[in-house]
């Protein structure tokens, strides 16, 4: 039975040209995390495997950095980076948990960070 919840950084905004950290945290479960996948609207950005560490998709190597922790850092942001990002936790024995983050990349310097919120 899946008892865990994923807490994410929720809706966030950042400035064009800047960087942002995408963070998810799995809580309320003792399940073992096998792997965490980071996706942007169906494109696989990166994988953090419990055994093997990080794998960054070749097409994102220049602008994606692993960490901190199981999070992901996006660099040199462009307006095209605006959209949904997903952290997908593969766990045993629970199975698959998914968290969602919406990133808005702004032209101006008035980027503000949204509040944290829970996804069951």
């Amino acid at each position: 039975m899946m008892t865990g919840t994923i807490e994410t950084t929720g809706n966030i905004s950042a400035e064009k040209g800047g960087s942002i950290i995408l963070q998810c945290h799995l809580s309320s479960t003792t399940a073992q995390v096998t792997q965490v996948n980071w996706e942007q609207q169906d494109q696989l950005l990166a994988i953090c495997n419990a055994d093997l560490g990080w794998h960054i998709s070749p097409s994102f190597k220049d602008r994606v950095a692993p960490g901190p922790g199981l999070g992901l850092t996006l660099q040199s942001l462009t307006v095209n980076d605006t959209g949904e990002y997903f952290c997908i936790y593969h766990t045993y024995p629970d199975g698959t948990y998914t968290g969602r983050i919406f990133l808005e990349v702004l032209e101006s310097s008035v980027a503000e960070h949204g509040a944290r919120f829970q996804i069951p």
Epitope: I47, L52, Y92, P93
Partner: antibody
Framework: EVQLVESGGGLVQPGGSLRLSCAAS????????MSWVRQAPGKGLEWVST????????YYADSVKGRFTISRDNSKNTLYLQMNSLRAEDTAVYYC????????????WGQGTLVTVSS | DIQMTQSPSSLSASVGDRVTITCRAS??????LSWYQQKPGKAPKLLIY???KSHTGVPSRFSGSGSGTDFTLTISSLQPEDFATYYC?????????FGQGTKLEIK
Amino acid sequence: EVQLVESGGGLVQPGGSLRLSCAASGFTFSSYIMSWVRQAPGKGLEWVSTISGGGTNTYYADSVKGRFTISRDNSKNTLYLQMNSLRAEDTAVYYCAKWLLSYYAMDYWGQGTLVTVSS
Amino acid sequence: DIQMTQSPSSLSASVGDRVTITCRASQNINVWLSWYQQKPGKAPKLLIYKASKSHTGVPSRFSGSGSGTDFTLTISSLQPEDFATYYCQQGQSYPYTFGQGTKLEIK
């Protein structure tokens, strides 16, 4: 070209043991999660066991837990399934399968090896 | 365990037909569903993963859709080589379970 070749199947008596092997080639074996899936004669597919790329984490179906052991030797590009205390209901074709790097599906399968448990 | 139920169990169709196979999960599995094709005496082959993503090299006539509990595999125009058994498999929670299969036969 990805290739998975199983071996080690055969006829064994109930209570006996067998060790299946799966020789992998055409990909970086140690980077991928691997599984064993079985198919009883004329029946559907049943997931048996999974092992992480480094071999640290192993997962089993309840029907084989405590009797089967999955392992891998990354230096030999080989996956194993040690099967003990075999029962008639373990009779099946056993397939080894490679998972996508994303761990979303099993993208390549071996041709299978038949295990028959009978007295 | 999550139960996967495919329908129909068997299906007769002709070359050129449009065919739809459905798979229903006993609980929400989000998009964590794969479709496999298996021919007699052969290993399964991956067609679709994550409900709608085509695996490399799979002909465009195969497509998948759905989320939650209801999923479909559609073959837009049957070819002679498509006559086989099709299985769905959920990857939402352990144990990863398969449907019972749908056997697609020539009419």
